[in-house]
Interface confidence: low
């Protein structure tokens, strides 16, 4: 906290300029009028502040939007927003893409901090669901941030922003996620045709039914074992050996490495050893 | 993301004088205002002169009529003139696009200005 104190004479500050860095905190506190700051904010980026400055900068706009700062503001805080906590930045309301890129520039290169977090919880919950461009902003900036969604959030996500999503986005979804992610991706390319809609949909299919499986089966995709593998157990257990030798296609060879390991274990479990043998691949049910 | 490399420092009789030179490298360097600072032991880094974009500058008290700061943005470079050193102005010194006010602020090795009595 700064004391307030009369600002020298001639130093009262006309405009937001180089010549700030040399006030002491004391004087850029008593000299820098607050709305001034608020409307050349743009300035402060450009200037070479250093940390304990910035902090003074800040007090100044929390006095004068104590309800939060304006769009206006927020949008050109740059590299003080470094310095606000996730309690400012709730009160925030931020509408526009521009505005939510210019502070994910601010933190890029780095993991996710909480007030990012919570930046993007605030534009999300304003917009009222995760569309297209949306995602394609946030999955640019953190490939990981879909996953990092609970399944309750992920429900908003409307099946046109699925295009936005790429196979990298997906790694590290859990199986509650992808359940309901297939829905949506399902629905999104729906209207490709079967080599096409397979390269699309493959990434999802962690979230697919047993009905799905069956249906891929008939459309030689040939799945590789590292999608196969992360199939839900439940949706594998039902298809016959002729279906999923159809579903991998060349790949089947792959079977026998994995046959240890879930979901094949226990789908070798689940057949007849007569109708494993056809396989040739040697796995004992 | 901008490189700097500092040098010019040494050692230097009390009065002497040093020219230091600071290298960037990347595009955008013109268009960044700069910093000379400088951190002697136990003491935090502090900022002694800068130079805008358009190159108005700026000096410490300590400093003022006794260091020059200029830049050429053709060379990509930043200089600092420092007349009548005292040894009080021995430090380490760097330069810097825009101080350490950003947590993972790429500083480089900064040059060792020493002056003796």
């Known amino acids: 906290e700064v004391e307030k104190t009369a600002c020298p004479s001639g130093k009262k500050a006309p405009e937001i300029d180089e010549s700030l860095i040399f006030y002491k905190k004391w004087e850029l506190e008593a000299c820098v009028d607050a709305a001034l700051l608020a409307t050349q904010m743009d300035r402060v980026n450009a200037i070479p502040f250093t940390y304990e400055q910035l902090d003074v900068l800040k007090h100044k706009l929390d006095e004068l939007y104590p309800q939060g700062y304006p769009e206006s503001v927020i949008q050109h805080l740059g590299y003080l927003f470094l310095k606000m906590s996730p309690e400012d930045i709730r009160k925030w309301n931020v509408t526009s893409l521009e505005t939510l890129k210019a502070l994910l520039e601010v933190n890029k290169g780095h993991e996710m901090s909480p007030q990012v977090a919570t930046l993007i919880d605030r534009f999300v919950k304003g917009r009222g669901q995760l569309d297209k461009d949306t995602l394609d902003t946030l999955t640019a900036f953190y490939p990981g941030y879909l996953c990092s969604l609970s399944p309750e959030e992920l429900s908003s996500v409307p099946p046109s922003s699925i295009w936005a999503v790429r196979p990298q986005d997906l790694d590290t979804c859990d199986p509650r996620q992808l359940d309901v992610l297939y829905p949506k991706a399902r629905l999104a390319f729906q209207n490709m045709n079967g080599s096409e809609y397979f390269v699309k949909i493959q990434s999802f299919l962690g979230g697919a039914p047993t009905e799905d499986l069956k249906a891929l089966s008939q459309q030689n995709v040939s799945m590789d074992l590292a999608t196969f593998m992360k199939l839900r157990t439940d949706a594998v257990l039902p298809l016959t050996v002729a279906e999923v030798q159809k579903l991998l296609g060349p790949h089947v060879e792959g079977l026998k490495a994995e046959e240890r390991h879930r979901p094949v274990r226990d789908w070798i479990l689940r057949q007849r050893q007569d109708d494993l043998d056809t396989l040739g691949l040697g796995l004992q049910g | 993301e901008v490189q700097l490399v500092e040098s010019g420092g040494g050692l230097v009789q009390a009065g002497g004088s040093l020219r230091l030179s600071c290298a960037a490298s990347g595009s955008t360097f013109s268009s960044y205002p700069m910093g000379w600072y400088r951190q002697a032991p136990g003491k935090q880094r502090e900022l002694v002169a800068a130079?805008?974009?358009?190159?108005?500058?700026n000096y410490a008290d300590s400093v003022k009529g006794r260091f020059t700061i200029s830049r050429d943005n053709a060379k990509n470079t930043v200089y600092l003139q420092m007349n009548s050193l005292k040894p009080e102005d021995t430090a380490v010194y760097y330069c810097?696009?825009?101080?350490?006010?950003?947590?993972?602020?790429?500083w480089g090795q900064g040059t060792q200005v020493t002056v003796s009595s």
């Open positions: 130079i805008s974009s358009g190159g108005s500058t």
């Open positions: 810097n696009t825009r101080s350490p006010r950003v947590p993972n602020d790429s």
